[in-house]
């Protein structure tokens, strides 16, 4: 969380960002929120991106401001314009490239006296894992799929049962680029599962975590998985 | 649940004042702003004004101004709004009425000022 | 102030009706308009807000829109918990300002 004031005394508001990652190829979110004014007229809202000439997005007089707009985000920025009223100057971020992390500054602007702050906006590519069990082996296996990570992650086993065990000998984890050559798919398997366990697959980059469990006993297969962002700190 | 209750109904007579309270409950008082409406009876809505508690910042219609009063006491989430020189054309319903997620969201049950000699 | 004309200022109509409000700014408000529904002795309802959203349970046979200074709330077929009065906001330029209110009533 960054919290931004104003430059000067009574002429400052609070401003406040939250560092946050986009997916590749998917909308994204810049999240900034500022002391609410009732003169929706009179509130600019500045979206600004370290090293990039023209704005990211601008908002003032209740519409959007684009004469100023860089090229890289044409067509690709929107702020929630009913939500600017109570202090939302989040922005919406279209097809998020990789070339759209580094550091962005939210400007606001309003009746009541001005205000920044800066966030931090990582880019990458995670996704959920599924872990099946994989018949076609010889051997009770486990099979960890994700379609789209990168940067490329670290993958991790671990079981309920023996709890601070090391998989790695046998498991076997490979990194398949996909079509658009940026991101990969990940693949790992596990060998001699025994009956009666829940395993976990742990996928792991800078930006997200990931994690696949499958419980599997004799008359059923029970499977949950959950993904957590990494950098979600507020400014 | 968000919640704006109100104080009861009152009766003034002309020049007196009359203060009423609003208890917000379900959402971070401080840090919306909170606004005043009033009905005359048969008659449509106007705003008062409204104030912002985290900073006991208040803005009034130019009609009100100088007549009106806006305050918060954050310790109970309470707002307040002061009417001064009361005369017969105040007689309405005055509510309370919070900007939360939009404009005017929420409303308190309305409080009846009655103005008589 | 911006004033808000809102017409008509009453109406009668039957159940299943199509009703259409129309509130009309003396500038551009920018689509910064909300609509409520008052009925007697009740504090008014938020129904409809930034021109055409939906407020969380209002029933989807309310719908608004319009730019500029030109705005509409439409109830596409009226049903008996509908009779009310309707006003409308603005919240673009200070003061926020209603419309003079539409009584809907039954035919």
């Known amino acids: 969380l960054i919290i931004g004031f104003g430059i000067s005394g009574r002429h400052s508001i609070t401003v406040t960002t939250v560092a946050s990652a986009g997916n590749i190829g998917e909308d994204g979110i810049l999240s900034c929120t500022f002391e609410p004014d009732i003169k929706l007229s009179d509130i600019v809202i500045q979206w600004l991106k370290e090293g990039v000439l023209g704005l990211v997005h601008e908002f003032k007089e209740g519409k959007d401001e684009l004469s100023e707009q860089d090229e890289m985000f044409r067509g690709r920025t929107a702020v929630f314009a009913d939500q600017v009223i109570v202090g939302n100057a989040s922005l919406r971020l279209k097809n998020v490239q990789l070339t759209d992390a580094g550091t962005y500054k939210c400007y606001i602007i309003t009746s009541k006296g001005k205000g920044n702050a800066n966030l931090e906006y990582k880019t990458g590519a995670f996704s959920m894992p599924e872990v099946n069990v994989d018949y076609n082996a010889s051997s009770e296996t486990l099979r960890c799929e994700a379609p789209r990570w990168f940067p490329q992650p670290t993958v991790v086993w671990a079981s309920q049962v023996d709890q601070g065990a090391n998989f790695s000998e046998v498991s076997n984890t490979s990194f398949e680029l996909n079509s658009e050559n940026v991101t990969m798919k990940v693949v790992s398997v596990l060998y001699n599962v025994t009956i009666n366990n829940t395993y976990s697959c742990m996928i792991e980059n800078d930006i997200a975590k990931a994690t696949g469990d499958i419980k599997v006993t004799e008359s059923e297969i029970k499977r949950r998985s959950h993904l957590q962002l990494l950098n979600s700190k507020a400014s | 649940e968000v919640q704006l209750v109100q104080s009861g109904a009152e009766v003034k007579k002309p020049g007196a004042s009359v203060k009423v309270s609003c208890k917000v409950s379900?959402?971070?008082?401080?840090?919306?702003?909170m606004h005043w409406v009033r009905q005359a009876p048969g008659q449509g809505l106007e705003w008062i004004g409204a104030?912002?508690?985290?900073?006991?910042?208040?803005e009034y219609a130019p009609k009100f101004q100088g007549r009106v009063t806006l305050t918060a006491d954050t310790s109970t989430s309470t707002a307040y709004m002061e009417l001064s020189s009361l005369r017969s054309e105040d007689t309405a319903v005055y509510y309370c009425?919070?900007?939360?997620?939009?404009?005017?969201?929420?409303w308190g049950q309305g409080t009846t000022v009655t103005v008589s000699s | 102030d911006i004033q808000m004309t809102q017409s008509p200022s009453s109406l009668s109509a039957s159940v299943g009706d199509r009703v259409t409000i129309t509130c009309q700014a003396t500038?551009?408000?920018?689509?910064?308009l909300n609509w409520y529904q008052q009925k007697p002795g009740k504090p008014p309802k938020f129904l409809i807000y930034?021109?055409?959203q939906l407020a969380e349970g209002v029933p989807s046979r309310f719908s608004g829109s319009g730019s500029g200074t030109d705005y509409t709330l439409t109830i596409s077929s009226l049903q008996p918990e509908d009779f009310a009065t309707y006003y409308c906001l603005q919240f673009y330029e200070f003061p926020p300002t209603f419309g003079g209110g539409t009584k809907v009533e039954i035919k």
């Open positions: 500038q551009d408000i920018v689509k910064s």
């Open positions: 379900g959402y971070p008082f401080t840090s919306y702003w």
């Open positions: 009425t919070s900007t939360w997620t939009h404009y005017f969201d929420y």
């Open positions: 104030i912002y508690p985290g900073k006991s910042d208040t």
């Open positions: 930034y021109t055409a």
